[in-house]
């Protein structure tokens, strides 16, 4: 009896794992083995595919074959017993195009209200992704084990920290990789769960802001308790993208080591041009807080995103605010060459109730004011670019009294 060729050959490539699956054509024939040949583009001869010779099952692995993953390859299969079937040719394919990104490796660390996620490619030193290592981005789905309500976080890198979590709570997550340059979305990792710790005695510092004064950067933050010492560290932001490297060499800012105030001042020349992460930690001598949320600090923008300068024209029921370019030292205006949005906060001098206006225009009306009342105003600028998402610090507050009633405009 003539042996029939195997049919329906499927090639599955995940990272550097090359798997072939096929269907037997004739289930009734026993003790059949299968063998594959391969042929590279531009070659006439067929070569035996190592790892896929005389296979008794309907699956084989040819990962050991050192292929150029960007080069087209053709496969053929036949069945063998006493005689052999005719060859069945598989459509040619390029391994890189066919490859899927496998599940990444995930390593979790817990704090009281945060989880640090370290992500590595599933295959270390992968040949398939050798040229794309730095292009991987990741997305994750996280949920409280008790509720199952999922939150998705997109476009993260090999280290990501999730804040504002609840202490002593189990969170679960899964991660997948993407190579957006090649339109490839990977497979999810297994689910990993971790429990946040008991609440720490000392909370981390909050609301970290960087501003520029003369030739210095001024770093400010808020803290709950007095009589503390603080330290500030920085890291090049691009290091979070380095696949497989999970040793982050945070560096001290010398002028911000063991400071006793909730701010520190350091020269601009501490940082070369670039994007950095900054974090602050508090200590009372016995206990230490966890690190604050990491803020992104872009020297290019920070150097120019100064608080706006404004004038107020007072009417009986409103203020007209005219926003001008901020002044550098030497009283020269700074040219802002990117679009800004302005946040204006105002309040009655005798009250703490603040109201907010967000405006793109540089002339703003603050309506619904009471006559003969002192109001205070402060403003800050934000970049409109979502990716940069920078804010200046607030300007100093300016207080003005509204005019008596029925003032004509």
């Amino acid at each position: 009896k003539n042996l029939k060729s195997p049919q329906k050959v499927e090639v599955d490539i995940i990272d550097d794992n090359f798997i072939l699956r096929w269907n037997r054509s004739d289930e009734s024939v026993g003790n059949v083995t299968f063998s594959f040949d391969y042929q590279k583009t531009g070659m006439d001869n067929w070569i035996k595919l190592s790892g896929c010779q005389n296979i008794t099952s309907t699956k084989c692995n040819f990962s050991s074959l050192k292929l150029n993953v960007y080069e087209e390859i053709k496969l053929r299969i036949r069945a063998e017993k006493e005689n052999t079937s005719s060859w069945y040719e598989v459509d040619s394919f390029t391994p890189f195009r066919k490859a899927q990104i496998g599940p990444p490796e995930v390593h979790l660390e817990a704090e009281d209200k945060a989880i640090v996620i370290h992500i590595s490619p599933g295959t270390k030193d992968s040949v398939m992704w050798a040229l794309d290592g730095l292009s991987f981005t990741y997305s994750l789905v996280i949920w409280k084990n008790s509720s199952g309500v999922e939150e998705r976080i997109e476009n993260i890198y090999s280290r990501h920290k999730i804040y504002k979590l609840s202490p002593e709570t189990t969170y679960c997550l899964k991660v997948k990789a993407a190579l957006l340059t090649s339109w490839k979305i990977g497979v999810y990792s297994p689910v990993h769960c971790i429990k946040t710790t008991v609440e720490n005695e000392l909370p981390p510092p909050e609301n970290i802001e960087v501003s520029v004064q003369n030739q210095n950067y001024v770093l400010k933050w808020d803290y709950t308790y007095a009589n503390m010492t603080f330290q500030v560290q920085w890291l090049h932001a691009f290091l979070k993208r380095n696949p497989g490297n999970h040793l982050y060499k945070w560096k001290q800012i010398p002028d911000c080591e063991n400071v006793k105030t909730t701010q520190c001042v350091f020269p601009q020349n501490v940082f070369q041009k670039g994007i950095y992460l900054l974090r602050v930690q508090a200590s009372d001598g016995n206990n230490t807080s966890f690190w604050s949320e990491e803020i992104k600090f872009d020297t290019e923008i920070q150097a120019f995103l100064l608080p706006p300068v404004f004038n107020i024209r007072s009417l009986s029921d409103s203020f007209h605010i005219y926003i001008g370019a901020p002044k550098q030292s030497g009283n020269t205006p700074v040219i802002q060459d990117y679009p800004l949005i302005y946040e204006i906060i105002f309040w009655e001098n005798t009250s703490n109730a603040e109201r907010k206006i967000i405006e793109k225009k540089t002339d703003v009306t603050v309506p619904n004011l009471k006559p003969l009342t002192v109001y205070c105003v402060k403003a800050r600028a934000h970049t409109m670019d979502e990716k940069l998402n920078k804010s200046s610090v607030f300007s100093d507050a300016v207080c003005e009294k509204t005019k008596p009633g029925n003032t004509s405009k």
Epitope: A110, T197, N200, H246, L247, N286
Partner: antibody, heavy 118, light 107 residues
Framework: QVQLVQSGAEVVKPGASVKVSCKGS????????MHWVKQAPGQGLEWIGR????????KYAPKFQGRVTITADTSTSTVYLELSSLRSEDTAVYYC???????????WGQGTLVTVSS | DIQLTQSPSFLSTSVGDRVTITCKAS??????VVWYQQKPGKSPKVLIY???YRVSGVPSRFSGSGSGTEFTLIISSLQPEDFATYYC?????????FGQGTKLEIK
């Protein structure tokens, strides 16, 4: 493969100084932290300090600050521990260790016994 | 400095036994704890890092758990080669500190 090879045993007099070396191979020391750990005879492990060979930044345990200096020579992939004003309680085995992913001391040298004796 | 207190300091035990070693930190260190094994005359060897991650090549009978201030190393079924001294270490803050060690002896 990753290896840390330390210099040989030393016998030194009280008040003197000693410099112990640790040569790394199979990895680039600039990409890691390098730590030193003390173990007195029959005692536990004590962290002395670490260096970032890339920029020579150091951290020391307060107990050792001032009497200990950690340095690195990236051209020879070697880190050094210098102990000064030695006293009998400095008699110990001193280990170097590599600080790798997740800040773990993942590879250790074989240890160097320093004996302080008159 | 963060103090780490291990218990017990000594343990007489037999092959096949399940062994639990605990490590208490004087303040919250998250999951930043490492466990080492040291045999006489040898350098320490990492077993567990980040409280619960087993190093590649370490037998599955070793497991770690805990977070915050309380951590545990479990050896599910003691083997002859496991008689050694075990140390916990925190890597949350400088200076890094070690527990005083737990010595496992053959009963």
């Amino acid at each position: 493969q990753v290896q840390l090879v330390q210099s040989g045993a030393e016998v030194v007099k009280p008040g003197a100084s000693v410099k112990v070396s640790c040569k790394g191979s199979g990895f680039n020391i600039k990409d890691y932290y390098m730590h030193w750990v003390k173990q007195a005879p029959g005692q536990g492990l004590e962290w002395i300090g670490r260096i970032d060979p890339e920029d020579a930044e150091t951290k020391y345990a307060p107990k050792f600050q001032g009497r200990v200096t950690i340095t690195a020579d990236t051209s020879t992939s070697t880190v050094y521990l210098e102990l000064s004003s030695l006293r009998s309680e400095d008699t110990a085995v001193y280990y170097c260790a590599r600080g790798g992913n997740f800040y773990v001391m993942d590879y250790w040298g074989q240890g160097t016994l320093v004996t302080v004796s008159s | 400095d963060i103090q780490l207190t291990q218990s017990p300091s000594f343990l007489s035990t037999s092959v096949g036994d399940r062994v639990t070693i605990t490590c208490k930190a004087s303040q919250n260190v998250g999951t930043n704890v490492v466990w080492y094994q040291q045999k006489p005359g040898k350098s320490p060897k990492v077993l567990i890092y980040s409280a619960s991650y087993r190093v590649s090549g370490v037998p599955s009978r070793f497991s770690g758990s805990g977070s915050g201030t309380e951590f545990t190393l479990i050896i599910s079924s003691l083997q002859p080669e496991d008689f050694a001294t075990y140390y916990c270490q925190q890597k949350n803050n400088y200076p890094y500190t070690f527990g005083q060690g737990t010595k496992l002896e053959i009963k």
